[in-house]
């Protein structure tokens, strides 16, 4: 009897199973009684990356320079091209199809996580006992100075911008 | 007990014609692809022709095609080749063949055609 | 079209000796080759499907390998009723093509 379904790797047509073209592969032509599916290569620019009934390969994804675009990772007949973001930049989605500057944590806010290819700067504001009074892409919050370890006062308390004052103790006699 | 049986050998002249006939037994006909396959005297051996299941798809080599055409009537559990314009190159022992999981899994014992004045 | 070439033609071997018979493609064809026997005024008898698969009521001694372009079939200890000829199929694309056979003979 014509089978109803087909195991994995194969797929029904004209009342019987085929075997799907493995990765890297697309199909010529469909299986007969007589013979297999017939598949061919993907050429050099192009993948497939399932077992698939495709009668085209896919185009590998094009790393477009004057959107900041790099290749990260060659694509393959079974892999697509991995993009990824110039020095400075980072992606504006998961599929990476174009890049945008990395933000810079300002005076008040260091940074949590630098920047990657595929991430923006995380910024997070300065806890007390911490400043930062610069616009900066990979400045952490620094800790305010300690004036007591310099034999010193606080003349002027520090903020999340400004680091503390020291100044002289002063001597009483 | 699967059976294949050919028929319809014999000499026939350039360009004649002869029909082949192949009964099939002991086994749900109409389930199975059937082949014809071909051996010249003392050669090896050479496909001719396919026929699905339900006989709606026919597969032939570019040497043949436009000259046989194969046939089947489920009914009666039997398959053809008609054979046209025949040449002395076609003199071969005709067999049929069962099309299991795409192999040719049961053969007849083959009937001879010999073409020549 | 593509081409099955069988090596050697003729294998001279005597009665429990191993016997190595080869049949390349022209082309890949994955595991799509069949391998059939053929005595004397007798039928084609399937031996060996899919390359490697055993077919039930033909002797364990009887195997076969390779993928893509290069296959082989092996006799472990040839008995006296294997002198005959040997057929590779392939049914990765039309039209069907055979091997041209390598016959196996007593030395």
């Known amino acids: 009897e014509p089978p109803t379904a087909c195991r994995e790797k194969q797929y029904l047509i004209n009342s019987q199973c085929c075997s799907l073209c493995q990765p890297g592969q697309k199909l010529v032509s469909d299986c007969t009684e007589f013979t297999e599916t017939e598949c061919l290569p993907c050429s050099e620019s192009e993948f497939l990356d399932t077992w698939n009934r495709e009668t085209r390969c896919h185009q590998h994804k094009y790393c477009d320079p004057n959107l900041g675009l790099q290749v990260q990772q060659k694509g393959t007949s079974e892999t697509d091209t991995i993009c990824t973001c110039e020095e400075g930049l980072h992606c504006t989605s998961e599929s990476c199809e174009s890049c945008v500057p990395h933000r810079s944590c300002l005076p008040g806010f260091g940074v949590k996580q630098i920047a990657t290819g595929v991430s923006d700067t995380i910024c997070e504001p300065c806890p007390v006992g911490f400043f930062s009074n610069v616009s900066s892409a990979f400045e952490k919050c620094r800790p305010w100075t300690s004036c007591e370890t310099k034999d010193l006062v606080v003349q002027q308390a520090g903020t999340n911008k400004t680091d503390v004052v020291c100044g002289p103790q002063d001597r009483q006699r | 007990e699967v059976q294949l049986v050919e028929s319809g050998g014999g000499l026939v002249k350039p360009g004649g014609s002869l029909r082949l006939s192949c009964a099939a037994s002991?086994?749900?006909?109409?389930?199975?692809?059937i082949s014809w396959v071909r051996q010249a005297p003392g050669k090896g051996l050479e496909w001719v022709a396919s026929?699905?299941?339900?006989?709606?798809?026919?597969y032939y080599p570019d040497n043949v095609k436009g000259r046989f055409t194969i046939s089947r009537d489920n009914a009666k559990n039997s398959l053809y080749l008609q054979m046209n314009s025949l040449r002395a190159e076609d003199t071969a022992v005709y067999y049929c063949?069962?099309?299991?999981?795409?192999?040719?899994?049961?053969w007849g014992q083959g009937t001879l055609v010999t073409v020549s004045s | 079209e593509i081409v099955l070439t069988q090596s050697p033609a003729t294998l001279s071997l005597s009665p429990g000796e191993r016997a190595t018979l080869s049949c390349r493609a022209s082309q890949t064809i994955n595991n799509n080759l069949h391998w059939y026997q053929q005595k004397p005024g007798q039928a084609p008898r399937l031996l060996i499907k899919?390359?490697?698969q055993s077919i039930s009521g033909i002797p364990a001694r009887f195997s076969g390998s390779g993928s893509g372009t290069d296959f082989t079939l092996t006799i472990s200890s040839l008995e006296p009723e294997d002198f005959a000829v040997y057929f590779c199929?392939?049914?990765?694309?039309?039209?069907?093509?055979f091997g041209g056979g390598t016959k196996v003979e007593i030395k």
């Open positions: 002991g086994f749900t006909f109409s389930n199975y692809g």
């Open positions: 026929i699905s299941s339900g006989g709606d798809n026919t």
């Open positions: 063949a069962r099309a299991g999981e795409k192999a040719m899994d049961y």
């Open positions: 199929q392939q049914f990765s694309s039309w039209p069907l093509t």
């Open positions: 899919y390359a490697s």
